[in-house]
Interface confidence: low
């Protein structure tokens, strides 16, 4: 979510308060890993209700991503799995630990394998079927949201080359059984099955066997339905403001969600003289994040002793699973100058990103 | 070292107002939430509220909503609790904590101050 | 809110004996977000467990906690005096933030 390296924009407008997060981890896994992040507490202190993050949305733990409040594992990932991760406070959004993940060779359809698992000589003359990757093959409980893309995996090899198939629920498993069909790559000993449905869910059963013997592993895919909708941002909310320097300045913003939505406050800013990032994104720095456990939040936004530079264009964004809505609105501040600023303490400074 | 620090005890009459005060210091006192938790003569802890000195935010327990107003100044590390109109029912030890670092439990706590009302 | 009721109220008990004290919520308090704490008269509450089952820093090893869900334990395994106080269990996962209403572990 934000920047590799944090800049600061010192002043009223980017108060974040906290220390400024390390800077962000780049990690890569291969496609069908467990993607594992820790995010121990500073010191080695307690450490409690936390909400892992991804691009922005929070991650609704499922069995294949177990959320933990010092550790994250999501487990058979693929190239969705991609993407900016971050440990943050449950109520204040304070990110405790940022991550850039990408997870390598992963096609979403299944399509450009890269043949890892294809059987090798292994130098034995004759043999029954067996398990290259029994790793891999852990994880037998398989949950995901509905629309995803769902690869069961069962590499194998002997000698002759074992040959291998599916059932579903105990009974053959062939394309025509579900609207989308299935890829079956043999090759990669895998069944991809695209853009999963609630009729998807059952025991998924790959049988592989050569005239030496057949072995046979089972999982369970569950499919979870979505929320019916995106956040909702109640029209006219927030609204444009004028204030007088020195004075207080409330903005509401009315969201609705029947997930828990992610609620951020943000301000646009400018780095170094430019108000969009390298790829053309504007620059943004949190004034407050949080996730909201009701499904109809009114948050408010309060500014204190405003300034001229507390001027500008905000934004009220909600995020959840389903995506994000957002409102930009103004502040225009005059009136006389007022008196010179104290210096923001650098504790109280906000993380700006392009956003 | 971290310590919450509370204003002495008060003896007040009912319908009197009353702001007493709990002084965060040896931590970043805008980075984490302050709690307050009242425990009643001989009973047990109920909590009442938390904020958020970095911009005030307040999260009120339902109990205690309209009935006390929590504040805070993070210029002088001060987080305060507030009462309009003060009732012998408020009679009790209030005690200002602090939220640990991922914002759940209480991990430090003031010496608390005595209230009591009476006519 | 979630009620937590806590089990014995008096725990009459000598030292070097072991307690154990029970906490058990009306509902689920969702991933153990639930801490103990010790209090002692005339004095502030004191964190003792968070998570459950986490220790907090500088609580000496015979405290224990366990439990998930809606049943949670205390256990002191060998009372030593300064043990012998109040002991309240606290829900954090779900708000209105709860406590139970405390168990008195007396000298017997």
């Known amino acids: 979510e934000s920047l590799g390296t944090e800049q600061r924009v010192v002043g009223r407008a980017a108060e974040v308060p906290g220390p400024e997060p390390g800077q962000q981890e780049q990690l890569v896994f291969g496609s069908g890993d467990a993607v594992e992040l820790s995010c121990p507490p500073p010191g080695g202190g307690p450490m409690g209700p936390t909400v892992w993050v991804k691009d922005g949305t929070g991650l609704v733990p499922s069995e294949r991503v177990l959320v933990g409040p010092q550790r994250l594992q999501v487990l058979n990932a693929s190239h969705e799995d991609s993407g900016a991760y971050s440990c943050r406070q449950r109520l204040t959004q304070r990110v405790l630990c940022h991550f850039s993940v990408r997870v390598t060779d992963a096609p979403s359809s299944g399509d450009d394998e890269d043949g890892e698992d294809e059987a090798e000589d292994t130098g034995v003359d004759t043999g029954a079927p067996y398990w290259t990757r029994p790793e891999r093959m852990d994880k037998k409980l398989l949950a995901v949201p509905a629309a995803n893309t769902v690869r069961f995996r069962c590499p194998a090899a002997g000698n002759p080359t074992p040959s291998i198939s599916w059932l579903k629920n105990g009974r053959e498993f062939r394309g025509e059984h579900r609207i989308g069909g299935i890829k079956l790559r043999h090759q990669q000993w895998s069944l991809v099955m695209e853009s999963v449905v609630p009729s998807d869910r059952g025991n998924y059963t790959c049988v592989v066997e050569n005239k030496f013997g057949s072995i046979r592993q089972t999982y369970t895919l569950d499919v979870l339905e979505r929320s019916p909708h995106r956040p909702i941002l109640q029209a006219g909310l927030p609204a444009n403001q004028t204030a007088v320097l020195g004075s207080d300045v409330e903005f509401h913003c009315k969201v609705y969600s029947d997930a828990q939505p992610h609620i951020q406050w943000l301000k646009h800013v400018e780095v170094n003289g430019s108000k969009v990032g390298p790829d053309g994104t504007p620059y943004v720095t949190v004034l407050k994040s949080w996730i909201s456990e009701s499904v109809e939040a009114d948050v408010r936004l309060r500014l204190a002793n405003v300034s001229e530079r507390d001027g500008g264009e905000y934004l009220c964004r909600a995020t959840n699973f389903i995506g994000v809505a957002e409102k930009a609105f103004w502040l225009s501040v005059h009136g006389p100058r007022a008196a010179e600023e104290e210096l923001v303490e650098a504790d109280e400074a906000g993380s700006v990103y392009a956003g | 070292e971290v310590q919450l620090v509370q204003s002495g005890a008060e003896v007040k009459k009912p319908g009197e107002s009353l702001k007493i005060s709990c002084k965060g210091s040896?931590?970043?006192?805008?980075?984490?939430?302050i709690a307050w938790v009242r425990q009643m003569p001989g009973k047990g802890l109920e909590w009442m509220g938390i904020?958020?000195?970095?911009?005030?935010?307040?999260r009120y327990s339902p109990s205690f909503q309209g009935q006390v107003t929590m504040s805070a100044d993070k210029s002088i590390r001060i987080a305060y609790l507030q009462w309009s109109s003060l009732k012998a029912s408020d009679t009790a030890m209030y005690y200002c904590?602090?939220?640990?670092?991922?914002?759940?439990?209480?991990?430090?706590w003031g010496q608390g101050t005595l209230v009591t009302v009476s006519s | 809110e979630i009620v937590l009721t806590q089990s014995p109220g008096t725990l009459s008990l000598s030292p070097g004996e072991r307690a154990t004290l029970s906490c058990r919520a009306s509902?689920?308090?969702?991933?153990?977000?639930l801490a103990w704490y010790q209090q002692k008269p005339g004095q502030a509450p004191r964190l003792l467990i968070y998570?459950?089952?986490s220790r907090a820093t500088g609580i000496p090893d015979r405290f224990s906690g366990s439990g998930s869900g809606t049943d949670f334990t205390l256990t002191i395994s060998r009372l030593e005096p300064e043990d012998f106080a109040v002991y309240y269990c606290?829900?954090?996962?779900?708000?209105?933030?709860?406590f139970g209403q405390g168990t008195k572990v007396e000298i017997k």
């Open positions: 904590a602090r939220l640990d670092y991922s914002g759940s439990w209480f991990d430090y």
């Open positions: 040896g931590y970043s006192f805008t980075s984490y939430w």
């Open positions: 904020i958020y000195p970095g911009d005030s935010d307040t």
């Open positions: 509902q689920s308090v969702s991933s153990s977000y």
């Open positions: 998570g459950a089952s």
């Open positions: 606290q829900q954090y996962g779900s708000s209105p933030w709860t």
